[in-house]
């Protein structure tokens, strides 16, 4: 069962796996959640009468029974991992810890204006795990305003001590705030020859890449496939690093694949979740349980529902014996990966899906899109919302996109005539406008945040955020879309769709059913040629067919231009303006969301 509560002045006795240092009990809980085996933890706070060298220790624990005896201890804070919980979990920690020195290997020392600048440097440095910044009141004059970038073998501090007039914090790479390049290519027949920092067993190159991304020091990797000539190295995933962050040598070798960590684009790429099934594959590891059940999907569900289970192998029944039930072997290991992989024994293997909730909800696979036709089907565009205005009469005003559990991204021009958020309602999970009745649940709008440089749609900055009055629980019909990664500036999106309930032609009415249209992106140069009297800036993005015929129109404003890349949907544009609707050689103009990622994050993550 999920226990989120922290127990003050309580120590969990026994079950120790390892001890790390964390600046708070909450951070200790997150570290425990991300550790392959940790189910419980005890944190020693600075209020503890214990020797100060024990302050900030985070003791990660495991227990077969998933519980441990509780002992009274002043200053100890204990709790459970979020592994047992269904809510989204993030490794993102934006806190700045005052009068705290988080120790690690300092590898860069430079002067910074403030702690935010220091944190930004850390976030945009591939090696940095955390930083310490000496404030302008630090006693040693020459050390004032010094920003120390640090890393460790584990990604957590080697020690934490109290120190006046310094502040410490973590890299925000896991908050999707890094500007580092995001190299998603997999290089076939390639071995990166740099030294290994670790090696694990993986069934394919994509699992290897996710493991590398999740590892604090892995910057790139090499994976030896099951056809690799040296048997003892088959399915081996070699995690690597280098000072420059790039492989120093690439060697051509068949049956090997190499690639890079996705640490700087991890918000829009599933890095924890390994959802695939591996047929005719047996994962070896420590056996947790053996259960009779029907089918490998049921076996995966069983593994996901069992806190200590990390991976499984399902052995299908022979013929029709045992009522069609096979054996489900629930397994675990010290690092969450199989100790060995065997083929040709008829098993079907896979991983627990409980790690999927550690990925951003926007990366969750949605129902396959229905190709052809204009009308959407339920669950096809779960981020699309309809924004209603209730005064003087209730009607659809604009589209919008869910980007967080309390945030909708839409167009600023939707609010040209809106005086107060009180007259707005957000309906999510809606396919047909006719579904909306008096008693249909909605989200009230607490705040409208319009970009302060917005004047009119045609001059740009046509972007606004709606802060909802209550938080949204994600379901199959309402969940967020990923923002494009700032490190992905070179991505060329091809699979792009515009959706909305807007007019189908210029003189028309709002549609009942959510409409969809696949539309190709148009270069800004081409778009500028079509709109000579306007300035098409890099903060705009255009889409449309040369011959016209498909476009966004009145009522679609604020809605998404959604593009699928690497199996993940990204909010590339916000429907903004255009000359007529679907006119020949008049593409639609959309707000270029990637240019506003900093603005979005600044507004949505303000305290």
């Amino acid at each position: 069962e999920c226990v989120t509560k922290l127990f003050k002045d309580i120590y969990f006795q026994g079950g120790d796996i390892t001890t790390v240092f964390t600046p708070s009990a909450k951070h200790c809980q997150v570290v425990c959640t991300h550790h392959p085996r940790c189910l419980l933890f005890t944190f020693i706070a600075e209020s503890s009468p214990e020797d100060p060298t024990k302050w900030f220790t985070c003791i990660l624990k495991d227990s077969v029974t998933e519980t441990l005896p509780m002992v009274n201890m002043t200053g100890a804070i204990s709790g459970y991992s979020f592994k047992q919980c269904s809510h989204q979990i993030s490794a993102c920690n934006k806190n700045i810890y005052v009068d705290v020195d988080m120790k690690g290997l300092n590898y860069n020392s430079s002067i910074a204006k403030n702690a935010q600048e220091c944190q930004e440097r850390c976030t945009n440095d591939m090696h940095c795990h955390f930083f310490t910044y000496a404030t302008r009141w630090f006693p040693s004059v020459e050390h004032r305003n010094i920003c120390l970038l640090k890393y460790t073998q584990t990604g957590t501090p080697t020690r934490i001590t109290k120190l006046s007039e310094v502040v410490s914090g973590f890299s925000l790479k896991s908050c999707a705030l890094s500007n580092l390049a995001c190299i998603r290519d997999i290089f076939p027949s390639t071995v990166f020859a740099d030294s290994n920092i670790d090696s694990v067993v993986a069934p394919d190159v994509f699992v290897c890449r996710r493991i590398c991304t999740h590892h604090p020091n892995c910057l790139f990797f090499t994976f030896f496939s099951q056809e690799w000539p040296k048997e003892s190295e088959r399915n081996l995933c070699l995690l690597k690093t280098s000072v420059s962050g790039l492989p120093s040598t690439r060697i051509k070798k068949n049956k090997a694949l190499s690639g890079f960590s996705l640490q700087s684009c991890r918000h829009s790429v599933p890095v924890f979740c390994h959802p695939s099934f591996y047929h005719d594959t047996d994962f070896l590891g420590e056996e947790l349980d053996i259960v009779d059940m029907k089918g490998h999907e049921a076996c995966q569900k069983m593994c996901t529902d069992t806190s200590r289970c990390q991976f499984f192998t399902y052995s299908p029944p022979h013929e029709s014996c045992n009522g069609g039930k096979g054996k489900c072997y629930l397994k675990l290991s010290s690092n969450g990966s199989p100790t060995k992989i065997l083929y040709g024994r008829g098993g079907i293997s896979g991983y627990t899906l409980r790690l999927c909730k550690m990925d951003n909800a926007c990366t969750t696979k949605i129902k396959p899109r229905v190709v052809g036709g204009r009308a959407s089907v339920p669950g096809e565009w779960p981020w699309q919302i309809t924004l209603h205005i209730i005064s003087p009469t209730q009607k659809h005003l604009c589209g919008g996109s869910i980007i967080g559990n309390q945030w909708i991204l839409t167009a600023a021009h939707c609010f040209d005539e809106v005086e107060s958020p009180k007259i707005l309602r957000v309906y999510s999970g809606i396919l047909n406008q006719s579904e909306i009745k008096e008693d249909t649940s909605f989200f009230a709008v607490q705040e409208i945040i319009i970009h302060d440089q917005y004047e009119i749609a045609e001059s740009g900055y046509d972007i606004a955020l709606l802060k909802l009055g209550t938080t949204m629980n994600y379901t199959d019909s309402q969940r967020p879309i990923c923002l494009p990664s700032k490190g992905d500036t070179n991505v060329i999106y091809s699979d792009c769709w515009v959706t909305g309930w807007g007019y189908r032609k210029l003189r028309d009415k709002i549609q009942n059913t959510l409409q969809k249209a696949e539309i190709p992106l148009v270069t800004n140069e081409e778009c500028q040629r079509r709109y000579r009297s306007h300035k098409i800036t890099d903060k705009m993005i255009c889409a449309g067919y040369k011959e016209g015929g498909k476009d966004a129109c009145k009522g679609d404003s604020g809605g998404p231009l959604s593009c699928k890349h690497n199996e993940v949907w990204h909010l590339v544009g916000i429907t903004s303006w255009g000359e007529g609707c679907a006119h020949r050689e008049r593409p639609g103009v959309y707000t270029n969301v990637v240019k506003y990622v900093d603005w979005i994050l600044e507004k949505t993550q303000a305290p």
Partner: antibody
């Protein structure tokens, strides 16, 4: 683990120059300042100067004109050069790592004798 | 330049005694003072930095206090292995400087 090791000539004639190397391991010179400190036989510690992680330098005012500190980050080495040596420069020379102005790790030191 | 003065060159003590060594700065150095221990034939060892912060692994019998210009280093209960020379150092402003040292010897 963190280590610092000084290596020097041992004996230098008066008016000659001195060059001592401090080779470090277990940490990066881009992230830490390195100090030079000397101790004449039977006397106290004297601060000579330092080089910061970003390459800036600071020197003891009295010795500034004779001292020069540099480093090679890739080789993990810091260099102390001192010219116009006199007999009162005879001392044990230490390099030490910076921790907010204090020195948390020291080398074993290298003895320099200035004598003809 | 800042001058650090340790008024006692020598101090006599017995095992179990409480002993305090003082250090005076020629100008305000805030709380940027460190204390080192040096035994014969060895390199100095950092005990205290920024007036009162104990370095990793330093026993809690060693403490430091003070601010501005007057600083004190205290050993609450002297052990035989504590007999050594103790130096203060200001790390407020470069050029950093050491005190002349105080030798702690057996009574």
């Amino acid at each position: 683990q963190v280590q610092l090791e000084e290596s020097g000539p041992g004996l230098v004639a008066p008016s000659q120059s001195l060059s001592i190397t401090c080779t470090v391991s277990g940490f990066s010179l881009t992230g830490y300042g390195i100090y030079w400190v000397r101790q004449p036989p039977g006397k106290g510690l004297e601060w000579l100067g330092m080089i910061w992680g970003d390459g800036r330098t600071d020197y003891n005012s009295a010795l500034k004109s004779r001292l020069s500190i540099s480093k090679d980050n890739s080789k993990s080495q810091v260099f102390l050069k001192m010219n116009s040596l006199q007999t009162d420069d005879t001392a044990r020379y230490y390099c030490a790592r910076d921790y907010y102005g204090s020195k948390d790790y020291w080398g074993q030191g290298t003895t320099l004798t200035v004598s003809s | 330049d800042i001058v650090m003065t340790q008024s006692h060159k020598f101090m006599s003590t017995s095992v179990g005694d409480r002993v305090s060594i003082t250090c005076k700065a020629s100008q305000d150095v805030s709380t940027a003072v460190a204390w080192y221990q040096q035994k014969p034939g060895q390199s100095p060892k950092l005990l205290i930095y920024l007036t009162s912060y104990r370095n990793t692994g330093v026993p809690d019998r060693f403490t430091g206090s003070g601010s501005g210009t007057d600083f004190t280093f205290t050993i609450s209960s002297v052990q035989a292995e504590d007999l050594a020379v103790y130096y203060c150092q200001q790390h407020y402003k470069t050029p950093y400087s050491f005190g002349g040292g105080t030798k702690l010897e057996r009574l």
